[in-house]
Interface confidence: low
Amino acid sequence: YDFTNCDFEKIKAAYLSTISKDLITYMSGTKSTEFNNTVSCSNRPHCLTEIQSLTFNPTAGCASLAKEMFAMKTKAALAIWCPGYSETQINATQAMKKARKSKVTTNKCLEQVSQLQGLWRRFNRPLLKQQGSSDYKDDDDKHHHHHH
């Protein structure tokens, strides 16, 4: 799925209001420095691609994130604010339902959600350009922010 045409501001608002808190709840009891961020993203569509992959694609050692609260809210936000996203996910959802056995929070899942937090932060705040000694021109700094 190409995330280029999503309403990024609406997705950001959903992240700030609920998804971020659900991620924190999932990670409760885990030190913020316990896992190193190894996954990153360069722009908002890329961030959403990585977020979608880590949230919904089962991985070795962690096959059970899709039914977590943060995942369901992520799916809802993408379905609402990314045109045509829902249609591309029907087959994938069926596959995930078959794969899912029980809800187990493994260390691998905690690490994966830690990576997700980093990706969401990067989505929420795109990187400064490597622009040398210039005026402040960070693209994302001019938009209107949303309250928590």
């Epitope: 420095t33 929420n124 400064l128 402040y136 922010h145």
Partner: antibody
Framework: EVQLVQSGAEVKKPGASVKVSCKAS????????MNWVRQAPGQRLEWMGI????????SYNQKFKGRVTLTVDKSASTAYMELSSLRSEDTAVYYC??????????????WGQGTTVTVSS | EIVLTQSPATLSLSPGERATLSCRAS?????MHWYQQKPGQAPRPWIY???NLASGVPARFSGSGSGTSYTLTISRLEPEDFAVYYC????????FGGGTKVEIK
């Protein structure tokens, strides 16, 4: 616990350069931005510039353009601020300040203890 | 460049009184942050994003405003509240106001 520990006080001659370090701990260094702010004796806070430790992207206050250089050493979780062509009015306390963007509006939530730079002939 | 002007420069009040600190921006900003600074110390974040109190900040503090006009209010001054308060915006660069010193009358 998030901590920013800065290098010690410096005394420099006019025309020289100074490089101040800021060692970060207690969080993932590349996740947040680092600002540099200075305060001359009895004066207001003055923003100098900002750097993204993730990719080295920088932006500077125009007032310091060409004189200030911000860099990072990711492996050491350390940010650096170098100010060149020093003059007496650069005498100030220099702070590094982490900028957390989990908050709306991007606030500076943790500050270093400050490094006093004295420029005197 | 967005210029922030704080007023008054000095506010002389007694403990128990109400303090109202103003910060005006030369052009509209999305949010305002406030920091408290005491002599010989680094600034401490006090209010985030106009109205959100930083961790450990007493409920007698509040922040409000929008556009070009923002206010920090202390409902009843306590001895530990006497300090300098700076406003700061993040819309264009990172600029601070000149500060308001809240001193004991």
């Amino acid at each position: 616990e998030v901590q920013l520990v800065q290098s010690g006080a410096e005394v420099k001659k006019p025309g020289a350069s100074v490089k101040v370090s800021c060692k970060a701990s207690g969080y993932t260094f590349t996740d947040d931005y680092m600002n540099w702010v200075r305060q001359a004796p009895g004066q207001r806070l003055e923003w100098m510039g900002i750097i993204s430790p993730y990719n080295g992207g920088t932006s500077y206050n125009q007032k310091f353009k060409g004189r200030v250089t911000l860099t990072v050493d990711k492996s050491a979780s350390t940010a650096y601020m170098e100010l060149s062509s020093l003059r007496s009015e650069d005498t100030a306390v220099y702070y590094c300040a982490r900028e957390d963007y989990d908050y709306d509006g991007y606030a500076m939530d943790y500050w270093g203890q400050g490094t006093t730079v004295t420029v005197s002939s | 460049e967005i210029v922030l002007t704080q007023s008054p420069a000095t506010l002389s009040l007694s403990p128990g009184e109400r303090a109202t600190l103003s910060c005006r921006a030369s052009s509209s900003v999305s949010y305002m942050h406030w920091y408290q600074q005491k002599p010989g110390q680094a600034p401490r974040p006090w209010i985030y994003a106009t109205s959100n109190l930083a961790s450990g900040v007493p409920a007698r503090f509040s922040g409000s405003g929008s556009g070009t006009s923002y206010t920090l209010t202390i409902s009843r001054l306590e001895p530990e509240d006497f300090a300098v308060y700076y406003c700061q915006q993040s819309d264009s660069g990172r600029e601070f106001g000149g500060g308001t010193k809240v001193e004991i009358k």
